[in-house]
Amino acid sequence: MMTGTIETTGNISAKKGGSVILQCHLSSTMAQVTQVNWEQHDHSLLAIRNAELGWHIYPAFKDRVAPGPGLGLTLQSLTMNDTGEYFCTYHTYPDGTYRGRIFLEVLESSVAEHSARFQIP
């Protein structure tokens, strides 16, 4: 029986040209995490992190994707095209597969600064 739950950073926004950390966390299960896959909004793979073999980054993203922190992924030099859904897929033993979703909105620098300036503390 799958008892675990995936917690994610949820909906996040970041500045164009900046960077953002995508994080998922699996809790409430003793299952062994054998691999975490990170997928983009078009369901293409960005990276794989195997528990023994480590990180394997898709070549097209090598310059813009940094592994970590932890099982997370850091996206750098953000463009407007990076806006969309991201998925973390946890492959575990013996539970099976858990999946989390993050929505990233990339904002034009001026818009991001403007919205940040008028946030209620």
Epitope: T34, Q35, L45, I48, E52, L53, G54, P59, H91
Partner: antibody, heavy 114, light 107 residues
Framework: EVQLVESGGGLVQPGGSLKLSCAAS????????MSWVRQTPDKRLELVAT????????NLPDSVKGRFTISRDNAKNTLHLQMSSLKSEDTAMYYC???????WGQGTSVTVSS | DIVMTQSHKFMSTSVGDRVSITCKAS??????VAWYQQKPGQSPKLLIY???TRHTGVPDRFTGSRSLTDHTLTISSVQAEDLALYYC?????????FGGGTKLELK
């Protein structure tokens, strides 16, 4: 040049044990996860063990779990596969493989037969 | 476990021919597919990873492609030295699994 040289194979009786070794050179061994992949007489490939770069985590399929142990000695650039309670179906060529399978050794042959 | 099926155990070809070796995954493995070549008496060698990226030193006559769960290794103009066993492998999910192999031989 990346080199992986396996040794330790041979003929062993069912229920017996064998320890395979792999000497690595030409790369920073301690930076890579490593695996053992076997090729059965009918040419099928099966991943039988993987180990993290620092040796802190291992993974073995159910077919060999409890019978095989993978280990490494980063000081000596060596990978090991301890095999016990061997069965006839373990007969295969065993390859030492680097990382995401980018370099393979020449293999060492294991025959389990009475 | 994900099953990788190479339906052709043998494929006959001639030097200069274009040949496509196929592999079907039992579920979507995205682009997490590699292809290996094994010549007689040798160990397997990585040709393609991430479905379409050639490994160092691999001639550009080898290309990999994907259409949903169907994965294909194409040799644009077969050379005599290409006669070998070819395997696909998925690394989308553990345990990583290999296809049964396709032997490329001369007609």
């Amino acid at each position: 040049e990346v080199q992986l040289v396996e040794s330790g194979g041979g003929l062993v009786q069912p229920g017996g044990s064998l320890k395979l070794s792999c000497a690595a050179s030409g790369f920073t061994f301690s930076s890579y996860g490593m695996s053992w992949v076997r090729q059965t007489p009918d040419k099928r490939l099966e991943l039988v063990a993987t180990i993290k770069s620092d040796g802190g985590s291992t993974n073995l399929p159910d077919s060999v779990k409890g019978r095989f142990t993978i280990s490494r000695d980063n000081a000596k650039n060596t990978l090991h596969l301890q095999m016990s309670s061997l069965k006839s179906e373990d007969t295969a060529m065993y390859y030492c493989v680097r990382g995401y399978f980018d370099y393979w050794g020449q293999g060492t042959s294991v025959t389990v037969s009475s | 476990d994900i099953v990788m099926t190479q339906s052709h155990k043998f494929m006959s070809t001639s030097v200069g021919d274009r040949v496509s070796i196929t592999c079907k995954a039992s579920q979507d493995v995205k682009t997490a597919v590699a292809w290996y070549q094994q010549k007689p008496g040798q160990s397997p060698k990585l040709l393609i990873y991430w479905s379409s990226t050639r490994h160092t030193g691999v001639p550009d006559r080898f290309t990999g492609s994907r259409s949903l769960t169907d994965h294909t290794l194409t040799i644009s103009s077969v050379q005599a030295e290409d006669l070998a066993l070819y395997y696909c492998q998925q690394y989308y999910s553990t345990p990583y699994t290999f296809g049964g192999g396709t032997k490329l031989e001369l007609k």
